[in-house]
């Protein structure tokens, strides 16, 4: 796994009464930010539930892994990790339960080499275009992520200054195409309805892609046909009813693809016909014999697998002329 | 902990066939890509085959019709079927695991010694 | 057939010297970074230690580093240490509408001055 291991040995702790004497100098190259624990040897820094409420400001040259989980942020401003020198070597960031509210364009420029960025469980009411591309030029220099972790970080309804949240999100994610080289991505628990069409067109380099306990409904004007290396779809604990012929034909002709579809309130009428077929043919499907069906009541429960035809019927719709009230 | 264990290398004669095995321990073989890489005595590094999570397999052109990659994800193991082997198959076989995220090889078995001779 | 060319093959250095490999693949390895560079010592398994051109695998002392894009490549050890002596391979990572493909430098050989 490419995730930077915590498990840093020789830490040294910085005393927090020393903060204010050594903020007044000159950095020390290697010196360890007051409430932090840092490792050389691991190239990690730890800055974990200190309450921190910004990003400090004498990190250690050297950082390859940085934490900065359980803190109080509120708002990375642009440059928020732009250090002279810069911090070049910095591969893994984790911003994750850090109450960041606010993203702002450029926020993780100056980072070259930053290849893994955590945010997850932070309420992003305002995620900027180009928080990750950080121009806001057409087609911006690439970025050097590969891994973007932004699991639960959905806002509370009433901070979501009346705009489409998803739409939001893809917005940073193509802005500029800089995040063609992208491979992994974790939308998890954002309460998505709909994923916009354009989105995945513009990752070419997925391989994981995890979209599991969101909202969606439907996979209809969703297109995977360009996600050649895409090895796992996580779909779990969403809201489909059905997939369609066509998200079905794309699946399966992508070479590595495994898809999970757990928890969803499959609709077991006749439109569902096509996609029995499939599962019963297809290997893409991970757990493929646990699909049961959640609706109508008479299929509640029924597993996906051992339906016929016969089962998968629609009632018939009464022209309005026969219709009662 | 994590880790591979080759078996299966032995001596045989030109033409004949071998199956190698690799068992895996500490994480699921079903999970990853899995790549099978060779070294001829005193020699280099010389990549075989691998199969991907889903069992899409890719061999390299000269290994392409005499061998097999699979894997039995019930026994956490993966195999190579050699057939027709030649004097120049002679190597130590490593077993291999890939990265999830990149296309690297991070974690290797020790090796298994193939000796195809009269 | 995709050809990876390390340069030199051999090279006797020191204690304390600076050491640079360079790796030269016949085509451009997938999304220009898709190379490993890997430490070998005899009989043993092979060891990683740098992924994606320039990063480095979890353990490995940062004298160690790698850079280049496409198909030009290069791992600097800056400073020699007694257990630097060993092999040392490239690898690179290949795709095209057949399928992957994977391939080895022939290897350098990095032995005591």
């Known amino acids: 796994s490419s995730s930077p291991t915590s498990s840093a040995s020789s830490f040294s702790s910085s005393a927090p009464f020393l903060a204010s004497a050594v903020s007044a100098q000159p950095p020390l190259p290697d010196q360890c930010p007051a409430l932090c624990e840092c490792s050389e040897a691991a190239r990690t820094v730890k800055c974990v539930n200190r309450n921190l409420t910004e990003v400090p400001t004498d990190l250690p040259a050297y950082v390859r892994n940085l934490f900065l989980t359980g803190n109080q942020l509120a708002v990375l401003p642009a440059g928020a990790f732009a250090r002279r020198p810069p911090l070049a070597e910095l591969a893994a960031l984790n911003l994750s339960g850090s109450r960041l509210d606010e993203v702002r364009a450029g926020a993780f420029e100056h980072l070259p080499s930053l290849r893994q960025l955590d945010l997850s469980h932070n309420p992003l009411a305002d995620l900027s275009p180009f928080a990750f591309s950080g121009s806001n030029a057409s087609v911006s220099a690439p970025s050097p992520l590969v891994e973007l972790i932004l699991n639960h970080i959905v806002p509370p309804e009433d901070e979501r200054q009346n705009r489409s949240f998803e739409g939001m999100v893809v917005a940073a994610l193509l802005a500029g195409r800089a995040l063609q080289g992208l491979r992994r991505l974790e939308l998890a628990s954002n309460h998505f309805l709909y994923l916009p069409r354009d989105v995945l067109a513009q990752l070419p380099s997925l391989r994981h892609l995890d979209l599991s306990n969101n909202s969606l409904v439907s996979l209809t004007y969703v297109s995977f046909r360009n996600l050649t290396h895409l090895e796992s779809l996580h779909l779990e604990d969403n809201a489909l009813k059905v997939l369609h012929n066509g998200t079905l034909a794309e699946l399966q002709g992508l070479p590595h693809i495994r898809v999970f579809l757990d928890n969803n309130p499959w609709v077991c009428d006749c439109h569902m016909a096509d996609m029995v077929t499939w599962l019963k043919e297809t290997e893409v499907v991970q757990g493929k014999d646990r699909l049961t069906c959640a609706y109508p009541e008479k299929m509640r429960n029924r597993v996906l697998l051992e339906l016929n035809s016969a089962d998968l019927d629609c009632d018939p719709i009464l022209p309005p002329s026969l219709q009662t009230s | 902990e994590v880790q591979l264990l080759e078996s299966g290398g032995s001596l045989v004669l030109p033409g004949g066939s071998l199956r190698l095995s690799c068992a895996a321990s500490g994480f699921s073989l079903s999970s990853y890509w899995m790549s099978w890489v060779r070294q001829a005595p005193g020699k280099g590094l010389e990549w075989v085959s691998i199969i991907a999570g889903r069992g899409s397999t890719y061999y390299a052109s000269w290994a392409k019709g005499r061998f097999t990659i699979s894997r039995d994800n019930s026994k956490n193991t993966l195999y190579m079927q050699m057939n027709s082997l030649r004097a120049e198959d002679t190597a130590l076989y490593f077993c291999a695991r890939v990265s999830s995220i990149y296309y690297t090889f991070n974690l290797w078995g020790q090796g298994t010694l193939v000796t195809v001779s009269s | 057939e995709i050809v990876l060319t390390q340069s030199p093959s051999s090279l006797s250095a020191s204690v304390g010297d600076r050491v640079t490999i360079t790796c030269q693949s016949s085509q451009s390895v997938y999304s220009n970074n898709e190379l490993s560079w890997y430490q070998q010592k005899p009989g043993k398994a092979p060891k990683l230690l740098i992924y994606y051109a320039s990063t480095l695998a979890s353990g490995v002392p940062s004298r160690f580093s790698g850079s280049g894009s496409g198909t030009d490549f290069t791992l600097t050890i800056s400073s020699l240490q007694p257990e630097d002596f060993a092999t040392y391979y490239c690898?690179?990572?290949?795709?095209?509408?057949?399928?992957?493909?994977?391939?080895f430098g022939q290897g350098t050989k990095l032995e005591i001055k």
């Open positions: 690898q690179g990572s290949y795709y095209s509408g057949s399928g992957w493909y994977y391939a």
